[in-house]
């Protein structure tokens, strides 16, 4: 039953909380089989999604997945938004579902997350690279 | 070959808190796209989906009863464990757990045989 | 919530013949991502349910190609081509393009 579709793992209501000023690499966990497709990042300006061209991405192969970064180096708040990553792969388009960064300005404490906040969101208290796509394999 | 089984109490008492565990085979919880979800018929009536735990142990709930539920995972085991809280005489259903695959979002493709659970004093 | 409605909800069939259930949806399953989360499900006497369609029209494993589904936006169908004893039961759609997910309230179908 193993299928050789394309599949992007993000999950609908996706979302990291990070802090402006430090790095974060948002990832796009890619399936496929034999030719690696391109993809690509967007974000979301309302209805349309404005691809993203000039920022720094990479691969990262694992075993039975890969993982398309967006590096944030660092983030800065006006990346706050959705993001959605799309592959092509012969001739078919695949879009992922929309990411969501909440960025906190390190400047502005009162919009810092709440002690509640941090113990519903527990990786808010990672750094970015232990930030809250646990990849298990 | 994929196969889900739950098992729990087939009687609860009214306020009690109702354990169930789906012990599953076949695949395994830590591959991306692989999701459990919980969901439940009363006697007659139709599905009422519950919760769900993703591959990276995300988790999501119906709004109308997320205030009485957890759900939890245990990769090493095969199980996950749906909790719910002040059980009532109209939580009598029968309980099934069901596997999420994944073609771009979650879709149903095994169930487990489903337990009944009755509520009452 | 995304209310799923079903018709009809009883459905006498006779063997050999075709036979179609219509589901509906209160908002449009076209989700952002271009894909339309419909699915449907079999549950025949007794036992618990089986998937039969995801994805609007495709086939699950196993399932044999008598079963077809169709639709958009919020109008959906499910046809048995020719039906056989083995497909009698109750048929479920679902959606998981709106948390929460939901289903239809079933369609029995019996034969004639």
């Known amino acids: 039953k193993e299928s050789c579709d394309v599949q992007l793992y993000i999950k609908r209501q996706s979302e990291h909380s990070i802090l402006a000023g430090d790095p974060f690499e948002l990832e796009c966990p890619v399936k496929y089989c034999a030719n690696r497709p391109h993809v690509t990042w967007c974000k979301l300006n309302g209805t349309t999604c404005v691809k993203l061209e000039d920022r720094q991405t990479s691969w990262k192969e694992e075993k039975n997945i890969s993982f398309f970064i967006l590096h944030f180096e660092p983030v800065l708040p006006n990346d706050n938004g959705s993001y959605r990553c799309s592959a092509n792969f012969q001739s078919n388009l695949i879009e992922s579902h929309s990411t969501t960064l909440y960025v906190t300005d390190v400047k502005s404490a009162s919009e810092r997350p709440s002690k509640d906040e941090m113990a519903s969101r527990p990786w808010l208290l990672y750094r970015h690279h232990h930030h809250h796509h646990h990849h298990h394999h | 070959q994929v196969t889900l089984k739950e098992s729990g109490p087939t009687l609860v008492k009214p306020t009690q808190t109702l354990t169930l565990t789906c012990t599953f085979s076949g695949f395994s919880l830590s591959t991306f796209g692989m999701g459990v979800s919980w969901i439940r018929q009363p006697p007659g009536k139709a599905l009422e989906w519950l919760a769900h735990i993703y591959w990276d142990d995300d988790k999501r709930f119906n709004p109308s009863l997320k205030s009485r539920l957890t759900i939890t995972k245990d990769t090493s085991k095969n199980q996950v464990v749906l909790t719910m809280t002040n059980m009532d005489p109209v939580d009598t259903a029968t309980y099934y757990c069901?596997?999420?695959?994944?073609?771009?979002?979650?879709?149903?493709?095994?169930w487990g045989q489903g337990t009944l659970v009755t509520v009452s004093s | 919530d995304v209310v799923m409605t079903q018709s009809p909800l009883s459905l006498p069939v006779t063997l050999g013949q075709p036979a179609s259930i219509s589901c509906k949806s209160t908002?449009?399953?076209?989700?952002?991502?271009?894909?339309?989360?419909l699915n449907w499900l079999q549950q025949r006497p007794g036992q618990s349910p089986r998937s039969l369609i995801y994805?609007?029209?495709k086939l699950d494993s196993g399932v044999p190609d008598r079963f077809s589904g169709s639709g958009s936006g919020t109008d959906f169908t499910l046809k048995i081509s020719r039906v056989e004893a083995e497909d009698v039961g109750v048929y479920y759609c679902?959606?998981?393009?709106?948390?929460?997910?939901?289903f239809g309230q079933g369609t029995k179908v019996e034969i004639k």
């Open positions: 679902w959606q998981g393009t709106h948390f929460p997910w939901t």
């Open positions: 908002q449009s399953l076209l989700d952002s991502d271009g894909k339309t989360y």
């Open positions: 994805l609007v029209s």
């Open positions: 069901a596997r999420g695959n994944w073609d771009g979002e979650t879709y149903f493709d095994y």
